[in-house]
């Protein structure tokens, strides 16, 4: 049973490699998948000496380890690329590193959008 499932239809999109891959750099992504399959949002980033370098954000295909995650939280200790996934529209806007060894929790907020 899929109780408490938050349906994901749209995610924040970002691609640091947008020029080479000929995509947009940032925006929103409408998630598309097969019928009856769940969809998620994800974020991936690097942490170089405390400087956060966003790699990619977007939609993520049905993945059991993403089920019922309302927030995007990476738990790996010190990977080359941090990864988190979550369920719910735009749930990857903010992302957090909460290392399993009990280090400090670090949440990354998107920069405020300039007023138009």
């Amino acid at each position: 049973s899929g109780r408490g499932e938050a349906e994901t239809r749209e995610c924040i999109y970002y691609n640091a490699n947008w020029e080479l891959e000929r995509t947009n750099q940032s925006g929103l992504e409408r998630c598309e998948g097969e019928q009856d399959k769940r969809l998620h949002c994800y974020a991936s980033w690097r942490n170089s000496s405390g400087t956060i370098e966003l790699v990619k954000k977007g939609c993520w295909l049905d993945d059991f380890n993403c089920y019922d995650r309302q927030e995007c939280v990476a738990t790996e200790e010190n990977p080359q690329v941090y990864f988190c996934c979550c369920e719910g529209n735009f749930c990857n806007e903010r992302f957090t590193h909460l290392p399993e060894a009990g280090g400090p929790e670090v949440t990354y907020e998107p920069p405020p959008t300039a007023p138009t």
Partner: antibody, heavy 118, light 110 residues
Framework: EVQLLESGGGLVQPGGSLRLSCAAS????????MAWVRQAPGKGLEWVSG????????FYTDSVKGRFTVSRDNSRNTLYLQMNSLRAEDTAVYYC???????????WGQGTLVTVSS | QTVVTQEPSFSVSPGGTVTLTCGFN?????????PSWYQQTPGQAPRTLIY???TRSSGVPDRFSGSILGNKAALTITGAQADDESDYYC??????????FGGGTKLTVL
């Protein structure tokens, strides 16, 4: 070091019940989905059940639906499989497994044997 | 009902190369099924070899590789060794909370 230790197996009569436990250590249990996989004597592996990080989503193979219930206690770092109305064909070694991103089983326990016989 | 098929048995000479395959009755296997491969010797728990089609699990020698070949997932062992003699299982993630195991391949190294 990641460790998964199953317990609770044994001999039970057809129609009886057992509760299997899987004690997890070496990782933050609440951060990972979990699964049960079984192997009948001389047969292949068969996925039995899966449970999401919160326990809010549970899934079963058709042959155990309505008889088995998977649950987890994140405060005790323990996964459970309640097995009711057991049948001879449920005889197997039951493994618990940790689920990682891209939905694969990255760590396995050593298994506990369930024998259903009169 | 989805059935995942593997060769029941296979033999390879020491130092040889063997490719085990994993298909299913409902169409082509693609990377979206996140195919993974497990090795099991009698009386032991399974060991994870390959996940997400072609990523080796930590500690797995590079003699083992995963791929998609045509409409199937594949596990290739190059330079087979005596201790590769085991049962090999593929698993497909069907989504919506469901996994399906293949029937397994018994590999003999002789």
């Amino acid at each position: 070091e990641v460790q998964l230790l199953e317990s609770g197996g044994g001999l039970v009569q057809p129609g009886g019940s057992l509760r299997l436990s899987c004690a997890a250590s070496g990782f933050t249990f609440r951060n990972y989905a979990m699964a049960w996989v079984r192997q009948a004597p001389g047969k292949g592996l068969e996925w039995v059940s899966g449970i999401s990080v919160t326990g809010g989503s549970t899934f079963y193979t058709d042959s155990v639906k309505g008889r088995f219930t998977v649950s987890r206690d994140n405060s005790r770092n323990t996964l459970y499989l309640q097995m009711n109305s057991l049948r001879a064909e449920d005889t197997a070694v039951y493994y618990c497994a940790k689920v990682y991103y891209t939905s694969f089983f990255d760590y396995w326990g050593q298994g506990t044997l369930v024998t259903v016989s009169s | 009902q989805t059935v995942v098929t593997q060769e029941p048995s296979f033999s390879v000479s020491p130092g040889g190369t063997v490719t085990l395959t994993c298909g299913f009755n409902s169409g082509s296997v693609s990377t979206s099924y996140y195919p993974s491969w497990y090795q099991q010797t009698p009386g032991q728990a399974p060991r994870t070899l390959i996940y997400n089609t072609n990523t080796r699990s930590s500690g797995v020698p590079d003699r083992f590789s995963g791929s998609i070949l045509g409409n199937k997932a594949a596990l290739t062992i190059t330079g087979a060794q005596a201790d590769d003699e085991s049962d090999y299982y593929c698993v497909l993630w069907m989504g919506s909370g469901i996994w399906v195991f293949g029937g397994g391949t018994k590999l003999t190294v002789l």
